[in-house]
Interface confidence: low
């Protein structure tokens, strides 16, 4: 807390200029009108001040709005938005995508900071979901973004918002949260043939059920080993071995190199070793000949 | 407009047969999975049997397996339900509803039942 | 066979309230997970797919989330026609198996 002083005669701030670097944080504090650096908050960030002498301008802004700052005044925030606690932010109400970029430039190059987690959070939250054009932004700025939030937050994405997702953005997600997002990638991509379709649903694949599996199997795909290593081990399971084959295309001999790995290991366990042989890779640990085979599996493919 | 309508309920003794068939319009019946679902009196929703697109993929519930037959005739547009050695407890309403269908080489059951028939209403009683 | 259990099996409300109805599977369906509201003498009519999905038509006040094993089906401000019976229906696994459903009655 900043003592209250009076202001030095001829010391009273007439505008937010340079000139208030050489100010001493009492002086910021008596002679700059907390209503005049609400209106000319853009200039604040164009001015070298110190972190104490920000603490100062703070002080007087949640002194003047101690229900919250209005969007006006936290667009222009700038590197002041550094000195908001998260429990500043929850009061907030920002509902332009253009506040949300502004204040992620101030951060951009670090982490994501508690502050910059509750600002999307409110901001999220006073939309009602995660469209595409705040998704673009966001991931813009946070590849990782997508994959922080939990799979709850993720029922909230509307399909139409998946456009916006790239391969990277998914690098970190884990199985529950592509349960979440396959689906939608699934109604978002819905209109598109063949290829084109594949190329997009790749990097959802993680979430997909067997029975889609088996569908892209007869399209020719010819999925990449990297993108079969991050398929769901009990949606592999029950793929045939002429369904796998079908499904790598020419990537099918690199099973080999990843046959001691989930979910090839688990894959091959399920398998009958004649019909591994047919693939004449070498690949071991199938079910030998004249051994029952229970079908443990409850799907049927139904398209 | 599309459309479900069943037909060929009726009041049947048990051990007896049935078939009920369901007429679709509006829509390219031969590329969607279809279903058929069943409400008893007062009580809950049960599915009962599903077939692809293609006739050879069919499934059924634990309940009605070995008794009941579902098949389609993509040339009449219809789904039928053979019901045989029929039982009290297979006194319901009988619904036929169609899969969502909603991207490419879809396996359709996964996404919900969005066009269902009026039902047609089975009784077995002796 | 996945068993599924919804939570009221029936409850009361008033025009304008925002009511929770929740779904609870035995094991992991994913997100494949839907909603329906059925009236007396009806057929069911799908509100909410995969979870989250919004059925084309289906009023903005109905809403869905959840994923693994936990669901909820929400209506933000209850409609005078929105007094039905609301089902859960799981279409991960075969065979597919409903909830018993929740009775939502005027107050």
């Known amino acids: 807390e900043v003592e209250k002083t009076a202001c030095p005669s001829g010391k009273k701030a007439r505008e937010i200029d340079e000139s208030l670097i050489f100010y001493k944080k009492w002086e910021l504090e008596a002679c700059v009108d907390a209503a005049l650096l609400a209106t000319q908050m853009d200039r604040v960030n164009a001015i070298p001040f110190t972190y104490e002498q920000l603490d100062v301008l703070k002080h007087k802004l949640d002194e003047l709005y101690p229900q919250g700052y209005p969007e006006s005044v936290i667009q222009h925030l700038g590197y002041l938005f550094l000195k908001m606690s998260p429990e500043d932010i929850r009061k907030w109400n920002v509902t332009s995508l253009e506040t949300l970029k502004a204040l992620l430039e101030v951060n951009k190059g670090h982490e994501m900071s508690p502050q910059v987690a509750t600002l999307i959070d409110r901001f999220v939250k006073g939309r009602g979901q995660l469209d595409k054009d705040t998704l673009d932004t966001l991931t813009a700025f946070y590849p990782g973004y997508l994959c922080s939030l939990s799979p709850e937050e993720l029922s909230s994405v509307p399909p139409s918002s998946i456009w916006a997702v790239r391969p990277q953005d998914l690098d970190t997600c884990d199985p529950r949260q592509l349960d979440v997002l396959y689906p939608k990638a699934r109604l978002a991509f819905q209109n598109m043939n063949g290829s084109e379709y594949f190329v997009k649903i790749q990097s959802f694949l993680g979430g997909a059920p067997t029975e889609d599996l088996k569908a892209l199997s007869q399209q020719n795909v010819s999925m990449d080993l990297a993108t079969f290593m991050k398929l769901r081990t009990d949606a592999v399971l029950p793929l045939t071995v002429a369904e796998v084959q079908k499904l790598l295309g020419p990537h099918v001999e690199g099973l080999k190199a990843e046959e001691r790995h989930r979910p090839v290991r688990d894959w091959i366990l399920r398998q009958r070793q004649d019909d591994l042989d047919t693939l004449g890779l070498g690949l071991q640990g199938g079910i030998p000949n004249g051994y029952l085979v229970l079908d443990l599996s409850m799907q049927e493919a139904l398209s | 407009q599309v459309q479900l309508v069943e037909s060929g309920g009726g009041v049947v003794q048990p051990g007896r047969s049935l078939r009920l068939s369901c007429a679709a319009s509006g829509f390219t019946f031969s590329s969607y999975g279809m279903h058929w679902v069943r409400q008893a009196p007062g009580k809950c929703l049960e599915w009962v049997a599903v077939?692809?697109?293609?006739?050879?993929?069919?499934n059924y519930a634990e309940s009605v397996k070995g008794r009941f037959t579902i098949s389609r005739d993509n040339s009449k547009n219809t789904l039928y339900l053979q019901m045989n050695s029929l039982r009290a407890e297979d006194t319901a309403v009988y619904y036929c509803a169609s899969a969502l269908r909603i991207a490419v080489a879809a396996s359709y059951y996964y996404y919900g039942l969005d066009v269902w028939g009026q039902g047609t209403t089975v009784t077995v009683s002796s | 066979e996945i068993q599924m259990t919804q939570s009221p099996s029936s409850l009361s409300a008033s025009v304008g309230d925002r009511v929770t109805i929740t779904c609870r599977a035995s094991?992991?369906?994913?997100?494949?997970l839907n909603w329906y509201q059925q009236k007396p003498g009806k057929a069911p009519k799908l509100l909410i797919f995969?979870?989250?999905s919004l059925q084309s038509g289906v009023p903005s006040r109905f809403s869905g989330s959840g994923s693994g094993t936990d669901f909820t089906l929400t209506i933000s401000s209850l409609q005078p026609e929105d007094f039905a019976t609301y089902y859960c229906q799981q279409s991960y696994e075969m065979p597919i198996t409903f909830g018993c459903g929740t009775r939502l009655e005027i107050k």
């Open positions: 077939i692809g697109s293609r006739e050879s993929n069919k």
């Open positions: 995969t979870a989250s």
């Open positions: 094991q992991s369906v994913r997100s494949f």
